[in-house]
């Protein structure tokens, strides 16, 4: 459409609103170095940024929350940027019998929204 | 168990950590008075409060987020308090043909966690 929908255009400027960002983390950072063998470093996608009024609202509840936050900011928090979906991640880890692959469904964010 | 798990005991004091809270809102507050007929006032359960380290972590991603926030607070936000489930709510609303009941699955929070 000619005008960007408020749900998708960030009124705060580029990169300020809720979006997916890659964060590098080592196994040591995560406290996993004693049981995860590989990879030594992970590219973790996380949800960061602000949730201005109606931006990427997760659902009706989030829309209401945004509206009530405008009316009662001390009582109702603004929506916040959280994962809407995840990408499965495979890690190689130590087991009693040797080495095994394990897949985590909820480790790396794939998309973000304001909830 | 004898000791409360860090996921469930709030280190910040009573009522400070992520929990469900009831917020009163009128149809006017919500901007719904032109199409919702009843009820005139809603009891909305919302998720409020802080998410200290590992408190009510939604999943592995939230645990990692909490840990990385401790290491890189400027880059990685703390987890935040969002609904983990919803309670269906029935509203009576105006339609072209009269009055109808409609159920909303994602309007009122039923439980909260830190994501």
């Amino acid at each position: 459409s000619a005008h960007a929908h408020p749900r998708d255009s960030c009124p705060l400027g580029p990169g300020r609103c809720c979006h997916l960002e890659t964060v590098q983390a080592t196994l040591e950072d995560l406290g996993w170095s004693d049981w995860v063998l590989s990879p030594r470093q992970l590219q973790l996608s996380m949800c960061v940024g602000e949730c201005p009024h109606l931006y990427r609202s997760a659902n009706t509840h989030a829309q209401i929350k945004a509206r009530l936050h405008g009316l009662q900011p001390d009582k109702v928090p603004a929506p916040c940027c959280v994962p809407s979906s995840y990408t499965p991640v495979v890690l190689m880890h130590r087991t009693d019998s040797g080495v095994s692959l394990q897949t985590y469904d909820d480790l790396v964010a794939r998309g973000c929204h304001c909830a | 168990s004898a000791h409360a798990h860090p996921r469930d005991s709030c280190p910040l004091g009573p009522g400070r950590c992520c929990h469900l809270e009831t917020v009163q809102a009128t149809l006017e507050d919500l901007g719904w008075s032109d199409w919702v007929l009843s009820p005139r006032q809603l009891q909305l359960s919302m998720c409020v409060g802080e998410c200290p380290h590992l408190y009510r972590s939604a999943n592995t991603h939230a645990q990692i987020k909490a840990r990385l926030h401790g290491l890189q607070p400027d880059k990685v936000p703390a987890p935040c308090c969002v609904p983990s489930s919803y309670t269906p709510v029935v509203l009576m609303h105006r339609t072209d043909s009269g009055v109808s009941l409609q159920t909303y699955d994602d309007l009122v929070a039923r439980g909260c966690h830190c994501a």
């Epitope: 063998l37 590989s38 990879p39 030594r40 992970l42 590219q43 995840y86 990408t87 499965p88 991640v89 495979v90 890690l91 190689m92 080495v99 095994s100 692959l101 394990q102 897949t103 469904d105 790396v108 794939r110 | -």
Partner: antibody, heavy 118, light 107 residues
């Protein structure tokens, strides 16, 4: 561009061993794992195992433990799979495939056709 | 081991058609499913991972969907170069396993 080069064919006697290679180019070899997959004539695909190319950790399908041994040579960006005590059941096409943590088997070699025959 | 079942060994289609290849897992695999295209004498080509994410360079007529136990690869506007065998694969738990394959043929 990413390429995984495998020899076209190997002919081996029953009871013997074979070591097949998979030479990687077009990316940093140690940034990805290397998987091996078997396809018998007219049949589906079977995952054999995986090797971490930087640390040489290996994880095998239980079915291929004792049959397959995975190794790497970082200096030549080459992964190897040795198959021992060969029988006619081992006659198949063997593929190497690059793998990551989220993109699982994104690039495959052309496959080596192993024929076990006297 | 998790069994991946592709109940249709063969599917007939025409150029321009829309076709759906299905795959069923014997237990919940979340979205840890990938799809591959294989032509005779060639290596498999990766199409989809994480059930619905297309690999770079894969035409958008290929769409993956599903979660849990039921998965679908849909090819809209089938082209002649799409006539091949399609395999699903789970990577939810080791050992990783593949479906038996579905061959897409011309009517």
């Amino acid at each position: 561009q990413v390429q995984l080069q495998q020899p076209g064919a190997e002919l081996v006697m029953p009871g013997a061993s074979v070591k097949m290679s998979c030479k990687a180019s077009g990316y940093t070899f140690t940034d990805y794992w290397m998987h091996w997959v078997k396809q018998r004539p007219g049949q589906g695909l079977e995952w054999i195992g995986v090797i971490d190319t930087s640390e040489s950790y290996t994880s095998y399908n239980q079915k291929f433990k004792g049959k397959a041994t995975l190794t790497v040579d970082e200096s030549s960006s080459t992964a190897y799979m040795q198959l021992s005590s060969l029988t006619s059941e081992d006659s198949a096409v063997y593929f190497c495939a690059r793998g990551g943590t989220t993109v699982v088997l994104d690039y495959w070699g052309q496959g080596t056709t192993l024929t076990v025959s006297s | 081991d998790i069994v991946m079942t592709q109940s249709q060994k063969f599917m007939s289609t025409s150029v321009g058609d829309r076709v759906s290849v299905t795959c069923k897992a014997s237990q919940n695999v979340g979205t840890a499913v990938a799809w591959y295209q294989k032509k005779p004498g060639q290596s498999p080509k990766a199409l989809i991972y994480s059930a619905s994410t297309r690999y770079t360079g894969v035409p958008d007529r290929f769409t993956g969907s599903g979660s849990g136990t039921d998965f679908t690869l849909t090819i809209s506007n089938v082209q002649s170069e799409d006539l091949a065998e399609y395999f699903c694969q789970q990577y939810s738990s080791s050992p990783w396993t593949f479906g038996g394959g579905t061959k897409l043929e011309l009517k």
